[in-house]
Interface confidence: low
């Protein structure tokens, strides 16, 4: 078949995968004239990863509350069993009726974009619904998502919200648009309007068309003991116990109080809708109870006291003191101050000792001076604020909060990497690679003790010597490792790691980077002795740096050869010695050569050794390098990429006979000649004319 | 009261589609998920997906996916549930159900499909 | 998806006694966000569609007879009847609205000795 380049550009070439993973297809280029040799394009193909998504996708949210989405919600898995980090939902369109947002980046008050399977576990990704200003019995959000893990093809989600009145909800005991009560004077009347009871939320829902149609009935279970209700002056009782919201709405409903006492007050009812002209229609309804709070005119409101935040740790529980919650009211005893939760944190809730396990939304102060009222910090390690209101049963409500830190109940300091000082400067910084903190999060306000300090540098903030110092500081890599004695490639410190009134210790090891250049190449030849030189190990640079001649120690290796001195001139007495040090003058003479040696006990083949060497220079530590080589068999048709100082036994047997091939030293200065002088003159011949040539 | 009143049954060949209407009355129509439920005879309920009426959103169980399809109506406040590629094993009893999110509280009488050459 | 199981197949009590029908999930259906079991029952009576009885494991939709008790967290549940009466004879069926496919148990029919 034939394929032009202009439908290859216009993508019109396509590749249909059958059969195995790897393979491809040749192809020939022709300008119709000329025609290229064969070409191979290679091929591999992947094995589709899939994503897909369990969980209900529906989210179920009592009006006006906040609501985490669960794996029972949302549950992504691919089918090549991808970390849930990686799985990423995108907000293709977010909610209408509320907000989603993040339980730990909730200060911007920006829309969430993205967010992690991962997250979705944690339970940090929230839902709020906000209450909107028309009354609704029953609504439904949707949030268009799209899921997506490369390589997989992305795929897209919907989740759908019910938010309704019909469910019982713990932060909303009502399931009335308000049922907020009623605050009168002691033997004075007052009225009640919606907005302080409201059921048009039941009217919502009937279709607007038919609202105007249906009305509210109101029955009254259980009267006022203390005071009458009355509807258009007319007083209610038991022959006639119903009031209509319309009647609500108009504000034809009072309530007079009989006088005699400041005690609590309040009625029963049963709220239903009601269909034209009376009749009963099927629809929501509830029963619950109106509360009247009766006020003595001449009281005092109670004042409340400064508060000091309470402090404890993930998963445990902390009594409530008067530290936190107090006033000052003469006229009421503790058991007749009411504080309510109007709003709880993410971060844990209140409980009752003998209450249930379960969150209270209502307490006296009797339940805090008694030790009763605690806080479960069963969140995450964050601040979080209750939002309460405190009531002496006599005054209206008053504003007051509750501020609960969380601190983590363990943390952990995270090490990713040592840290590398540069040969010549002696000196690095520190970074998060070194030192970060995390406990069930990111702890940027740690802060770090030295306990136990380097032995051979010091710890500098600003060029001064320090035994403490911050995450931030670290972070602006204002912490500086620097030797202060030149006589150890390596060196570790201890450090104690504070954060939120936790504690942890690391240690930090240091290590000397050298300052030199390795240049292995190519595979070098087994059985063959090439030159070491500065093509190969190089550290003039930090001889520069210095002003002084760098000297070589060989810690280990090489395992299959090794290291030797090679004579001068043949004049010079014995072979070469074996080296164990040796200097960056002596790389630069051409001085010194390795042996490569065959691995032994096995067959012949490509192998892998290396060189351990402490480079050592003055005034700054010594640092430790490896030179890493591949060898091989030696072939003669191979150019190598050193210069060769001897080839093995057999091959220079071989070099005698006239068609053998010869080595050459490509592309290095002083490679072998292409007719090399062991052929000739003999083994010292041959280093000559490679050496001096 | 809340009524969902289906269509009535019918016999269809193999091969053949079919469509099934509930009509919902009784409540407010987009405010509730509807769910199509069918029953082999003498067999048990197998869910066969939702449909929300509000924004026309469905959710299909996988062994229907690509046969089933979940309409809805608001102007009659009613719901259409297509199946395709009908084989004798579809002969059950469909029934639409109105749920709060996931449970059925309210049930269509039924209708009787029967599949057959 | 969940797969749900009930025992016995069936069962035969006197009037007046007390029915237990089990229902087993092959994964919690316990919602651990407000601490609910998303399990439902049902009675269906021949030539009718099914009736829902309980939901959330343990409530008792309106209008149900409180014979009709629900119990059980995480896998296993339980629905009893505590005082049989002529008009209970039927099929219960148990399912699971903790996530898509819901899921029915196979049924358990319930006769009058």
């Known amino acids: 078949r034939t394929r032009s380049g202009s439908q290859l550009d216009g993508g019109l070439v396509l590749f249909s995968h059958r059969g195995t993973l790897d393979g491809g297809f040749r192809f020939r280029l022709s300008d119709g004239e000329h025609t290229s040799p064969g070409h191979f394009f290679r091929v591999t193909a992947q094995k589709q990863v899939l994503l897909s998504l369990k969980g209900s996708q529906t989210l179920t949210v009592c009006p006006g509350s906040v609501q985490p989405l669960s794996s029972q919600t949302l549950r992504a898995s691919s089918s090549a069993g991808t970390d849930p980090q990686l799985l990423l939902y995108r907000v293709v369109r977010g909610p209408q009726l509320g907000r989603l947002f993040h339980a730990q980046q909730d200060s911007t008050g920006e829309a969430l974009v993205n967010f992690t399977q991962a997250e979705v576990y944690a339970g940090n990704i929230l839902y709020e619904h906000e209450m909107p200003p028309e009354p609704f019995w029953e609504a439904h959000d949707t949030l268009e998502l799209q899921l997506s893990s490369p390589p997989a093809r992305d795929v897209a989600a919907t989740l759908a919200v019910a938010v309704s009145f019909e469910a019982a909800c713990p932060q909303r005991p009502s399931h009335l648009w308000k049922n907020k009560g009623l605050w009168v004077p002691e033997g004075q009347r007052a009225r009640i309007t919606v907005a302080a009871l409201d059921a048009s939320n039941l009217l919502a829902s009937v279709p607007s068309p038919q609202r105007s149609e249906h009305d509210v009935l109101f029955q009254v279970t259980q009267f006022p003991s203390r005071g009458q209700l009355l509807v258009s002056e007319e007083p209610l009782h038991a022959g006639q116990p119903h009031f209509l919201q319309s009647q609500l709405a108009a504000g034809q409903l009072v309530y007079a109080h009989g006088g005699g006492g400041t005690q609590q007050d309040g009625f029963h009812f049963r709220a239903h809708l009601q269909g034209p002209a009376g009749a009963s229609v099927a629809g929501p309804q509830t029963s619950e109870a109106f509360a009247i709070t009766v006020r003595d005119v001449n009281e005092r409101p109670p004042q409340p006291q400064a508060s000091v935040p309470l402090r404890l740790t993930r998963g445990s529980r902390a009594p409530i003191s008067r530290a936190q919650l107090s006033v000052v009211d003469p006229d009421s005893a503790p058991g007749e101050i009411e504080y309510e939760v109007q709003r709880a944190p993410h971060n844990g809730f209140l409980s009752l000792v003998g209450g249930g396990l379960g969150p209270v939304t209502r307490f006296t102060q009797a339940d805090v001076d008694s030790g009763r009222l605690a806080f479960v910090a069963n969140g995450s390690s964050v601040a979080g604020i209750f939002q309460l209101s405190m009531s002496d049963g006599a005054s209206p409500p008053l504003p007051m909060s509750l501020a609960v830190d969380i601190l983590p109940s363990a943390i952990e300091v995270q090490l990713r990497a040592p840290l590398e000082v540069p040969q010549a400067l002696g000196r690095s910084s520190l970074s998060q690679q070194q030192l970060r903190v995390v406990s069930d999060r990111e702890e940027p306000e740690a802060a770090y003790r030295l306990i136990q300090g380097p032995q051979y540098g010091h710890l500098l903030v600003g060029g001064r010597p320090t035994s403490a110092f911050s995450q931030f500081q670290i972070d602006q890599g204002e912490v500086v490792f620097a030797f202060t004695n030149s006589s150890s490639s390596h060196d570790h410190f201890r450090v104690l790691a504070l954060a939120r009134g936790v504690n942890a210790s690391a240690v930090v090891n240091v290590t000397v980077r050298a300052l030199l250049h390795v240049w292995a190449g190519g595979p070098w030849p087994q059985g063959a002795t090439l030159r070491l030189d500065p093509t190969v190990l190089d550290a003039g640079e930090l001889a520069n740096r210095t002003d002084s001649v760098p000297r070589f120690r060989l810690l280990e290796g090489p395992r299959h050869g090794r290291v030797v001195r090679v004579p001068r001139a043949r004049t010079e007495p014995g072979g070469s010695q074996l080296v164990e040090q040796f200097t960056q003058q002596d790389l630069e003479d051409g001085r010194l050569g390795l042996e490569v040696g065959r691995p032994e006990g096995r067959a012949p083949g490509p192998a892998g050794d290396s060189l351990t060497l402490e480079l050592w220079a003055q005034g700054v530590p010594p640092a430790v390098a490896s030179l890493d080589f591949a060898t091989e068999p030696y072939n003669a048709a191979r150019p190598y990429s050193v210069a060769l100082l001897s080839v093995p036994e057999a091959a220079r047997t071989e070099a005698g006979k006239p068609e053998s091939s010869t080595p050459t030293g490509e592309p290095g200065p002083m490679a072998s000649s292409p007719e090399p002088a062991v052929a000739k003159g003999g083994f010292l011949s041959f280093l000559e004319a490679n050496m001096f040539s | 009261q809340v009524q969902l009143v289906q269509s009535g049954a019918e016999v269809k060949r193999p091969g053949a589609s079919m469509k099934v209407s509930c009509k919902a009355s009784g409540y407010t129509f987009t405010n509730y998920y509807i769910h199509w439920v069918r029953q082999a005879p003498g067999q048990g309920l197998e869910w066969m997906g939702w449909i929300n009426p509000n924004s026309g959103a469905t959710n299909y169980a996988q062994k229907f996916q690509g046969r089933v399809t979940m309409t809805r109506d608001t102007s009659t406040s009613t719901v259409y549930m297509e199946l395709s590629s009908l084989r004798s094993e579809d002969t059950a009893v469909y029934y639409c159900?109105?749920?709060?999110?996931?449970?059925?509280?309210?049930w269509g009488q039924g209708t009787l499909v029967t599949v057959s050459s | 998806d969940i797969v749900m199981t009930q025992s016995p197949d069936s069962l035969a009590v006197s009037l007046g006694e007390r029915a237990t029908i089990n229902c087993k999930s092959s994964?919690?259906?316990?919602?651990?966000?407000?601490?609910?079991?998303?399990l439902a029952w049902y009675q269906q009576k021949p030539g009718q569609p099914p009736k829902l009885l309980i939901y959330?494991?343990?409530t008792r939709e309106s209008g149900v007879p409180d014979r009709f008790s629900g119990s059980g967290s995480g896998t296993d549940f339980t629905l009893t009847i505590s005082g049989l009466q002529a008009e209970d004879v039927a099929v219960y069926y148990c399912q699971q609205h903790y996530s898509t496919p819901f899921t029915f148990g196979p049924g358990t029919k319930v006769d009058i000795k």
């Open positions: 994964q919690s259906v316990l919602n651990s966000s407000n601490n609910r079991n998303y």
């Open positions: 959330w494991a343990s």
């Open positions: 159900a109105k749920s709060w999110v996931s449970w059925f509280a309210s």
